[in-house]
């Protein structure tokens, strides 16, 4: 009696279990009672990454430099090309089809997490005792200068955008 289910790496067709094509190959013709499944290798710049019964291979992704993309992993007959972004840019989506410039953290904000090829800069407001006076994609909030350790006194209070200004202590005459 004909099978209703097939083993792993097989598929059911015409009441018969046929072997799937291995990764890197596409289906040309199904097996018959007398012949094996016929498979053909994918062409150059094409791939199939699973055991399959596809009649066409997928095209490799193109990491278009005009979109700020570059190749992270070259495509093969079994794997697609993996794109990432040029330095200073990050992917706009998980599929990494285009890139945008890393955001900078404005004065008063510091970098909590530096951007990568796939994630943007994460900024955080500088808490009391810290400041950032630049717009940067790398700079963290810096601690206010400690006037006391320099035997000086605070002449001007710090803010989230400016450091404290230290000055000499008033001498008793």
């Amino acid at each position: 009696e004909p099978p209703t289910a097939c083993r792993e790496k097989q598929y059911l067709i015409n009441s018969q279990c046929c072997s799937l094509c291995q990764p890197g190959q596409k289906l040309v013709s199904d097996c018959t009672e007398f012949t094996e499944t016929e498979c053909l290798p994918c062409g150059e710049s094409e791939f199939l990454d699973t055991w399959n019964r596809e009649t066409h291979c997928h095209q490799h992704k193109y990491c278009d430099p005009n979109l700020g993309l570059r190749v992270q992993q070259k495509g093969t007959s079994e794997t697609d090309t993996i794109c990432t972004c040029e330095e200073g840019w990050h992917c706009t989506s998980e599929a990494c089809e285009s890139c945008v410039l890393h955001r900078s953290c404005s004065p008063g904000f510091g970098v909590k997490q530096i951007a990568t090829g796939v994630s943007d800069t994460i900024c955080e407001p500088c808490p009391v005792g810290f400041f950032s006076n630049v717009s940067s994609a790398f700079e963290k909030c810096h601690p206010w200068t400690s006037c006391e350790t320099k035997d000086l006194v605070v002449q001007q209070a710090g803010t989230n955008k400016t450091d404290v200004v230290c000055g000499p202590q008033d001498r008793l005459r």
Epitope: P23, G24, P41, C42, G43, E44, S45, E46, D49, Q59, H60, Y62, C63, R70, V71, Q72, Q73, K74, G75, T76, S77, E78, T79, D80
Partner: antibody
Framework: EVQLVESGGGLVKPGGSLRLSCAAS????????MHWVRQAPGKGLEWVAY????????YYADTVKGRFTISRDNAKNSLYLQMNSLRAEDTALYYC????????????WGQGTLVTVSS | DIVMTQSPDSLAVSLGERVTMNCKSS????????????LTWHQQKPGQPPKLLIY???TRESGVPDRFSGSGSGTDFTLTISSLQAEDVAVYYC?????????FGGGTKVEIK
């Protein structure tokens, strides 16, 4: 028998242009990706550019980006490299090499054509 | 860009002796999808173009004598000639076939002692 024959090399002044050709025979040219690789006199190998079998994908080395253009004519079994704004450091033997869809490696190389950039 | 570093730059070995050369990449050449290391070796004899010797780290190209063998994974690779023959005098280049730009090592020159 697989054959790759480069031509078009020669002496050119800095800032000048040159077009290299690579004539392929002995295999189905349109089934293969193609590369240009160069070798400065007495030096090692430097990859220059790649074009996929169907012209869809093109990559360049940073050293030639914006100056060199790789192209192919599958009907003529030919690969090309248009070289503009040539510099002294582009002086090298230029090889074409094919890439198949199985190994994804350069499995055959031509004999090379010499490009000399000098005033 | 991936930097490929070969060592030694050159070596002189007696005929019939074993030859070992190394290649180090600045990042892994392991394809995460198919678990193959995309490290290629080319042989360039004097006055000739390069010739593909080994791909996927250890797979010999058709027609390459079995005295040539490749090994390694990730970032460290080795090419071995088990018994040096006169026709093996050449420069051997390792190549990153994992990503663009494709990059080559500086080469190891093999001579007869």
């Amino acid at each position: 028998e697989v054959q790759l024959v480069e031509s078009g090399g020669g002496l050119v002044k800095p800032g000048g242009s040159l077009r290299l050709s690579c004539a392929a025979s002995g295999f189905t040219f349109s089934d293969y990706g193609m590369h240009w690789v160069r070798q400065a006199p007495g030096k090692g190998l430097e990859w220059v550019a790649y074009i996929s079998s169907g012209n869809r994908i093109i990559y360049y080395a940073d050293t030639v980006k914006g100056r060199f253009t790789i192209s192919r004519d599958n009907a003529k079994n030919s690969l090309y490299l248009q070289m503009n704004s040539l510099r002294a450091e582009d002086t090298a033997l230029y090889y074409c090499a094919r890439q198949d869809g199985y190994r994804y490696a350069m499995d055959y190389w031509g004999q090379g054509t010499l490009v000399t950039v000098s005033s | 860009d991936i930097v490929m570093t070969q060592s030694p730059d050159s070596l002189a070995v007696s005929l019939g002796e074993r030859v070992t050369m190394n290649c180090k990449s600045s990042q892994s050449l392991l394809n995460s999808g198919n678990q193959k290391n995309y490290l290629t070796w080319h042989q360039q004899k004097p006055g000739q173009p390069p010739k593909l010797l080994i791909y996927w780290t250890s797979t010999r190209e058709s027609g390459v004598p079995d005295r040539f063998s490749g090994s390694g994974s990730g970032t460290d690779f080795t090419l071995t000639i088990s018994s040096l023959q006169a026709e093996d005098v050449a420069v051997y280049y390792c190549q990153n076939d994992y990503t663009y730009p494709l990059t080559f090592g500086g080469g190891t020159k093999v001579e007869i002692k």
